[in-house]
């Protein structure tokens, strides 16, 4: 069975295919292959010899025991290798050699006992090393990591690395690697000498599910004093063993890092006294809760130093009281509990992301809801119910809004956005807001993105609402209901490069009102019930137009239409999916495609 | 099309059946097994997944006795700092995890369920399995 | 088995050419693709060109690329290396490579080539 040509000539797919030798009806310029669950059991030496321009190699469960020497001899360009589940028992001690460009080496699930003996030392461009899931016992970085200079992460997860000591970070001292980020979760560790970590700079550590114990954790956190890391993860997996108990004891230990961002990933244990459980982490940059559950809700007004705060997927008893100073980024995501939005106090916020949480929204919005001027993004995306009783008052500075597929309320009774002269950025799509009032986008004179997809429209018609959206250059109006645009519509839009009309309800096309747009690149007319033109006939669309999408609509492929399709013909090199229009009357001609279609009408005499 | 069997509880019969042409094994086990009346038990999965797991969620397609419910999406892995450590497996990597579960209170009536659980993962998204249970619910008292 | 002799090496002025060849006995039925490495001193071997013998596709790296020329005689089975523009950073010992159905990797034992003036 042949591979599959996914990029001809360059990409080939031959996944599976009970292949007990490497290919060899390959052209010799493929670029990526993917040999991955082929019994191919032995890799002798030069291999891949008519591979010449190999950049990525998936060898994932080969069934690999033996890699000769040379096996991948002179694949100068190879990027990436993927060794995933091969059950190597014999690693030559040149197997890599020839891999003079390789960035990513990944042999997870490979045997592989210990990193001393694994024979990368000469891979000197290796940014990316995987070896989680393996049996390694000792921590050791051996002295040929002092090459690989350009390492940026070492995975090192899911092994059997019990302790680390002074001796075995060694190497780092002698090259510190500043943007190393290692990952160690999942090893059963119950001891980190203390000073092992003293001095060494890391990008990122993690450590998940570690500990077995409270005092292991503890201990081992201690372990950890002099280390300065960027960015530190600690917690647990939900499908592994949980820690019994968790109290501030357990990061004490932290008062003796430097730490620029903290995150606390999962943890099957009720946070109640945060205060004191964070008690090191009040100046860090970042602060981060992924799945966990907050008891008290009041503990986020003290005075803790985090210029970003991160909640995700988290568990509350209500929306949790917000006053911290010198914040300037709140994530508050996918959260669980305290339905009711409330106020919060964060002066010098500018970005706030409030998205997923199923929140409602009795007054929106104001300074006043925020605490804050300085707002410059705002994302109320998928939440309940918004009532927008304010035109944003005090935040002013906008320039990012998103409520997508939230349910807002009053939003054509007045000009909402009037005050927002900055904005760049809105996305009111599917918010059940339906179009009634002319003066709805006023104010918005700095808009480049608008996206109205899956609203309604008085009358399903389409009136004169964006004449002060002079900058707008993206426009998506699908999902409306739409049957009728006025022919001024887009007069004021000459910035316009994409405009969105798909799955809408027009029966007929007119090039008229879009004679003003004369940067339009993307037209989309797609999914209407778009038989015929509006007038006999069309003009031209802008000379600007790239691509025009008229696929899946209703065609009427007869005499009295040929002028029409004479014209949609004539606009081929502009239409994409050709195959795609087809003819939808009469019922002899259903489902032929428009353009191959030769109507030959007799003149009545 | 081949079925394979789960388990019987005192009031449920599980067993499901693949809904994709590639039928790639997976191994799942129950215990002890659900009871629809309250439940509380350990999943336990084997599987060698053909791509990456990032990014996995689940499309469900349930059907109660023949009446289809809207689909629902249900994400596992958001693709960073995952609740589950199998959301870091790699295509190839032998996936073999517990997980705990625990639900009570929701009472079902009698008759057939059936659940089409697509698994979608990676970037791009591609299909990674999919399954098709049907549990058979017999109330002792309802 | 197959066996792989390469001649045709040399000392050359830059700008020079030369012409290597490549003479396949033994189990040549057995061979799918056929090529030149070099090995510069220090340094490790890399691909030049290759041509495949089904068919007569071939690949040049980007270093040769318009200044050599692979070719093959079925009748003779023979592969020959035109080398025109010669520079200096063209000086290695060149080998002739060939690769069977099996994946197995045969080798010449390469000959010399230097461009200096």
């Known amino acids: 069975e042949p591979c599959v040509e996914v990029v001809p000539n360059i990409t080939y797919q031959c996944m599976e295919l009970n292949f007990y030798k490497i290919p060899d009806n390959l052209p010799f310029s493929t670029k990526n292959l993917d040999l991955s669950f082929n019994p191919l059991r032995h890799l002798g030496s030069y291999s891949f010899f008519s591979f010449p321009e190999l950049q990525v190699l998936d060898l994932s469960r080969c069934e690999i025991q033996t890699i000769e020497d040379g096996a991948y001899q002179s694949l100068s360009h190879l990027s990436t290798l993927i060794l995933t589940g091969n059950p190597i028992q014999s690693l030559a001690l040149g197997a890599f050699s020839g891999l003079s460009s390789l960035q990513k080496l990944v042999a997870v699930e490979t045997n592989l006992a210990s990193l001393e003996n694994f024979p990368i030392g000469h891979l000197k461009t290796l940014k990316e090393l995987n070896v989680a899931h393996n049996l390694i016992q000792s921590f050791k970085l051996p002295e040929y990591f002092s090459n690989l200079t350009n390492l940026e992460h070492l995975d090192l997860s899911s092994n059997k690395i019990q302790s680390i000591y002074c001796t075995d970070l060694r190497v780092l001292h002698q090259m510190p690697l500043l943007n190393l980020s290692l990952d160690l979760s999942l090893n059963p560790m119950n001891f980190i000498q203390p000073g092992a970590f003293k001095e060494i700079r890391l990008h990122k550590l993690t450590l998940r599910n570690n500990f077995d114990s409270l005092n292991v954790m503890k201990t081992c956190i201690q372990g950890l004093a002099g280390l300065e890391v960027h960015r530190l993860v600690l917690g647990e997996f939900r499908n592994e063993g949980n820690l019994e108990k968790f109290d501030k004891s357990a990061l004490e230990g932290l008062c003796n890092l430097t730490i620029e961002e903290f995150r606390l990933a999962y943890l099957d244990y009720y946070l109640d006294d945060i205060i004191d459980l964070f008690n090191c982490l009040t100046n860090v940059s970042s602060f981060s809760l992924v799945s966990v559950t907050i008891e008290r809700v009041k503990d986020f007004s003290y005075n803790f130093g985090w210029q970003h705060l991160e909640l995700v997927n988290c568990k509350f008893g209500q929306f949790p009281t917000l006053k911290l100073k010198s914040l300037k980024r709140l994530t508050f995501t996918s959260n669980k509990g305290g339905n009711a939005f409330s106020e919060v106090d964060l002066p010098s916020l500018e970005f706030l992301d409030l998205s997923r949480n199923g929140l409602s929204f009795k007054g929106c919005c104001s300074q006043s809801d925020f605490g804050t001027t300085s707002l410059k993004y705002l994302d109320l995306s998928f939440n309940g119910v918004i009532t927008m009783s304010s035109n944003f008052l005090g935040l002013e500075q906008l320039e990012h809004l998103d409520f997508q597929h939230s349910n807002l309320k009053q939003m054509s009774e007045f000009s909402v956005f009037l005050s927002l002269r900055n904005l760049i950025y809105l996305d009111i799509s599917h918010t059940h807001t339906r179009v009634a009032f002319n003066g709805i986008f006023n104010g918005l004179s700095s808009l480049e993105v608008l996206k109205m997809a899956g609203n309604s429209f008085q009358e399903n018609f389409l009136p004169d609402i964006f004449t002060e959206l002079r900058n707008l250059t993206f426009l998506d109006l699908s999902q409306c209901q739409l049957e009728q645009l006025s022919p001024t519509a887009f007069n004021s839009l000459s910035s316009l490069q994409v405009l969105n009309m798909s799955h809408n309800n027009f029966f007929s096309l007119d090039t008229f009102p879009y004679k003003c747009l004369n940067s339009l690149q993307v037209l989309d007319y797609s999914l209407n019930h778009i038989m015929t033109s509006k007038k006999q006939e069309l003009q031209h669309f802008p000379s600007s137009l790239a691509f025009l999408n008229l696929t899946q609509n209703d065609f009427a492929c007869t005499c009295e239409h040929q002028s029409f399709l004479q014209w949609i013909k004539d606009q081929r090199q502009l239409l994409v999916e050709v195959e795609r229009m087809e003819c939808a009357t009469p019922s002899d001609k259903q489902g032929m495609p428009v353009l191959s279609l030769n109507i030959t009408c007799q003149m009545n005499k | 099309q081949k079925q394979y069997w789960v388990c019987n509880s005192s009031d449920a019969s599980i067993s499901y059946t693949y809904c994709d042409k590639m039928q790639y094994p997976i191994s799942i086990n129950v215990n002890p097994c659900i009871e629809l009346k309250r439940s509380k038990g350990l999943l336990h999965i084997f599987y060698i997944p053909r791509r990456d797991l990032k990014q996995l969620y689940f499309n469900l397609y349930i059907t109660v006795n023949t009446m289809n419910l809207p689909k629902r999406k249900e994400v596992i892995c958001r693709g960073s700092d995952d609740d589950y450590s199998f959301c870091r497996a790699l295509k190839g990597e032998t996936v073999n995890t517990t997980i705990s579960f625990s639900f009570k209170g929701i009472k079902f009536s009698k008759g057939k369920y059936k659940c089409v659980v697509e698994a979608i993962s990676g970037s791009p998204e591609e299909m990674l399995f999919c399954l098709e249970f049907v549990i058979l619910h017999q109330p002792n008292s309802n | 088995e197959v066996q792989l002799v390469e001649s045709g090496g040399g000392l050359v002025q830059p700008g020079g050419s030369l012409r290597l060849s490549c003479a396949a006995s033994?189990?040549?039925?057995?061979?799918?693709?056929m090529g030149w490495f070099r090995q510069a001193p220090g340094k490790e071997r890399e691909h030049v060109a290759l041509?495949?013998?089904?068919?007569?596709?071939?690949y040049y790296a980007d270093s040769v690329k318009g200044r050599f020329t692979i070719s093959r005689d079925n009748a003779k089975n023979t592969v020959y290396l035109q080398m025109n523009s010669l520079r200096p950073e063209d000086t290695a010992v060149y080998y002739c490579?060939?690769?069977?159905?099996?994946?197995?990797?045969?080798w010449g034992q390469g000959t010399q080539v230097t461009v200096s003036s």
């Open positions: 490579g060939a690769k069977t159905g099996t994946s197995f990797v045969y």
């Open positions: 041509i495949r013998i089904k068919d007569g596709s071939i």
């Open positions: 033994g189990s040549i039925f057995s061979i799918n693709d």
